[in-house]
C-alpha cells in the first residue's frame, strides 16, 4: 500500500488588527520563516546531452551545490531511483564506481559533480525523451535528487542547460543535522514572537501521511507535489527503456527512513506558494519529496561497522568507508 504525503502547506495568518502594527506583526514572521526555510538549502543540477557523433549516445552530467561531503551518487533513468527508475550507475567516493549497461563510462569530474556516458546501441539504449535522475547523498544535508531529459526538439550536440533543482528530498541525516537545527531555531523564534506579541503566527500544517502505512515508497512523488509543480512523470516514454535487461536493478533493501516532516525549500508566498513555484527549464523536472518513511524495528539493508545513515540502492556495504570489517 502506498500513502500519498501532502506537501506541507503554509496556512494564511489569522485575521489581525488593521494598521502598521498589524502589518509588521504579519510580515516579520513571514520574513523570518523565509530566511530560515531557505537558508543553506542545497541544490542538484542535471544536464543531459546527445552526442553529435553518435545520435543515440548520451552524456549526463550532474552536480551538487552544497557544502556537505558527498557519500554516494546514484544515476538512474526512467524516473527517480526506486520509483520506477532503473539504476545506471552508483558512484562512491571511496569504494569506486559500479555501472550497469547501457552505462559506458561514469566518472567523478570534480568533488561534487559526475558524468556518465551511455552506450548508443542495443536494445537497452536510451532515446531523446528518456528521463535521467541523479541522487546525491551527502552529509549533513541528506539525500537530494534531480531529474532531467533532453528538450523535445534538441539538435544533436546540443544540450539542455544545467537545471538546478530548487526543492528536493531531504533525508534523515540532513533533517537531523543542519536542517533540524535551523528548523528548531526558526520554530523557537516564531514561538518567542508569538509570546511577545500575543498574536497568532503563521504555522506549518503537518503532513497528512497515514501513520498506518510507514512503508510508503520514499522515492515516489506525491500527487500533491505533482499537481502543484506540474511534474510530467506520467508522460515519460518508457518504450526506450530496456524491456529485458540481464543487468542489475539494484533497488534492494527495505524502506527504513524515519517518518518526519521536511521543511519547504521554497520562499513561502502565502497559501498559493507551491502552485506558483518556478518550474525548471523545459525538458527537465524536479523530484519533490516531502515525507520520510521507516519500518519500525526493521533491519536496514545492510548493517555492520562503518555503516552510515544512507542506504545504498545497490545493496551490500555501499556506504561503508575504507575501514570495514577485516
Amino acid at each position: 500500500m502506498r500513502t500519498e504525503a501532502q506537501v506541507p502547506a503554509l496556512q494564511p495568518p489569522e485575521p489581525g488588527l488593521e494598521g502598521a502594527m498589524g502589518h509588521r506583526t504579519l510580515v516579520l514572521p513571514w520574513v523570518l520563516l523565509t530566511l530560515c526555510v531557505t537558508a543553506g538549502t542545497p541544490e542538484v543540477w542535471v544536464q543531459v546531452r546527445m552526442e553529435a557523433t553518435e545520435l543515440s549516445s548520451f552524456t549526463i552530467r550532474c552536480g551538487f551545490l552544497g557544502s556537505g561531503s558527498i557519500s554516494l551518487v546514484t544515476v538512474s533513468w526512467g524516473g527517480p531511483n526506486g520509483a520506477g527508475g532503473t539504476t545506471l550507475a552508483v558512484l562512491h567516493p571511496e569504494r569506486g564506481i559500479r555501472q550497469w549497461a547501457p552505462a559506458r563510462q561514469a566518472r567523478w569530474e570534480t568533488q561534487s559533480s559526475i558524468s556518465l556516458i551511455l552506450e548508443g546501441s542495443g536494445a537497452s539504449s536510451p532515446c531523446a525523451n528518456t528521463t535521467f535522475c541523479c541522487k546525491f547523498a551527502s552529509f549533513p544535508e541528506g539525500s537530494w535528487e534531480a531529474c532531467g531529459s533532453l528538450p523535445p526538439s534538441s539538435d544533436p550536440g546540443l544540450s539542455a542547460p544545467p537545471t538546478p533543482a530548487p526543492i528536493l528530498r531531504a533525508d534523515l541525516a540532513g533533517i537531523l543535522g543542519v536542517s533540524g537545527v535551523l528548523l528548531f531555531g526558526c520554530v523557537y523564534l516564531l514561538h518567542l514572537l508569538r509570546r511577545h506579541k500575543h498574536r497568532p503566527a503563521p504555522r506549518l500544517q503537518p503532513s497528512r501521511t497515514s501513520p498506518q502505512a510507514p512503508r510508503a515508497r520514499a522515492w515516489a512523488p506525491s500527487q500533491a507535489s505533482q499537481a502543484a509543480l506540474h511534474v510530467p512523470y506520467a508522460t515519460i516514454n518508457t518504450s526506450c527503456r530496456p524491456a529485458t535487461l540481464d543487468t542489475a536493478h539494484p533497488h534492494g533493501g527495505p524502506s527504513w527512513w524515519a517518518s518526519l516532516p521536511t521543511h519547504a525549500a521554497h520562499r513561502p508566498q502565502g497559501p498559493a506558494a507551491w502552485a506558483s513555484t518556478p518550474i525548471p527549464a523545459r525538458g527537465s523536472f524536479v523530484s519533490v519529496e516531502n515525507g520520510l518513511y521507516a519500518q519500525a524495528g526493521e533491519r536496514p539493508p545492510h548493517t555492520g561497522p562503518g555503516l552510515t545513515l544512507f542506504p545504498d540502492p545497490r545493496g551490500p556495504r555501499a556506504m561503508e568507508g575504507p575501514l570495514g570489517v577485516r
Epitope: E109, Q111, T247, P316, E320
Partner: antibody, heavy 120, light 113 residues
Framework: EVQLQQSGPELVKPGASVKISCKAS????????MNWVKQSHGKSLEWIGE????????NYSQKFRDKATLTVDKSSNIAFMELRSLTSEDSAVYFC?????????????WGQGTSVTVSS | DIVMTQSPSSLAMSVGQKVTMSCKSS????????????LAWYQQKPGQSPKLLVY???TRESGVPDRFIGGGSGTDFTLTISNVQPEDLADYFC?????????FGGGTKLEIK
Amino acid sequence: EVQLQQSGPELVKPGASVKISCKASGYMFTDYYMNWVKQSHGKSLEWIGEINPNNGDTNYSQKFRDKATLTVDKSSNIAFMELRSLTSEDSAVYFCAKEGVSSYYAMDYWGQGTSVTVSS
Amino acid sequence: DIVMTQSPSSLAMSVGQKVTMSCKSSQSLLNSNNQKNFLAWYQQKPGQSPKLLVYFASTRESGVPDRFIGGGSGTDFTLTISNVQPEDLADYFCQQHYSTPPTFGGGTKLEIK
C-alpha cells in the same frame, strides 16, 4: 577466517553446459558482491560479472552476457556460475572472488579456482 | 573499457635485488572526488589463486610484507619489490578498480635467478 571453496574440476563436451559453485564462509555472505573471473591457460584474468547475494541482482561484462549466468543460494552461502554452449574457448580456470571491503573491485579473497575443460 | 598494459612481460632477478614492474592504463584512474588512484596489484603463485597485494595504488593489504611498494598516479603505476625473496616467484597482475568492468593487465612473470 574468510574462505571461498569452489567445486571440483569439470570435463564437458562442446555445446553442453556446466554449473560451478563457490561456498563462502567466515564473513556475512549477503554483505558483499561476489565476482567471477576467468583465467585462460597461461593468460591474464578476465572479469565475467558479479552478483549481489542480498537480492540476486547481477552485472555482466559485455563479453560474457550470453555465456554466463550467476545465481546465489542465500540460505547456504553459495554462489553459482553456469556456463552454456561451451566451446574450446571456454576451457579455463574460473575463480570466484569476494568484493573488497575498501573498494568494489579490489577483490580481497579468492576461491582456489575451478578448472573447466571442454573436449569431445 | 579501460585497457591495462603491463611491462615487462617477464623478468629474472636474484634474491635480494630490487625489482620494479610497470602498469599503464588507457585513462586516468585518479578519482577527482578524493584524489585516490583506483589501481590494485595481485600476486599469483604457480598453481594458486591471485592474492591482493596493493589497492588504491599504494595501500598494502593487511599481511603483505612491506617490501612490496605500490606507486604512481593517473595512468602510470609501478610495483616495486625492494628485496626480492625466493617466495616472490609469481605472476603479478595490475587491475583497475575504478569502475565496471574491472580490467586486468597482461601480467609480469617474475623469475628468480
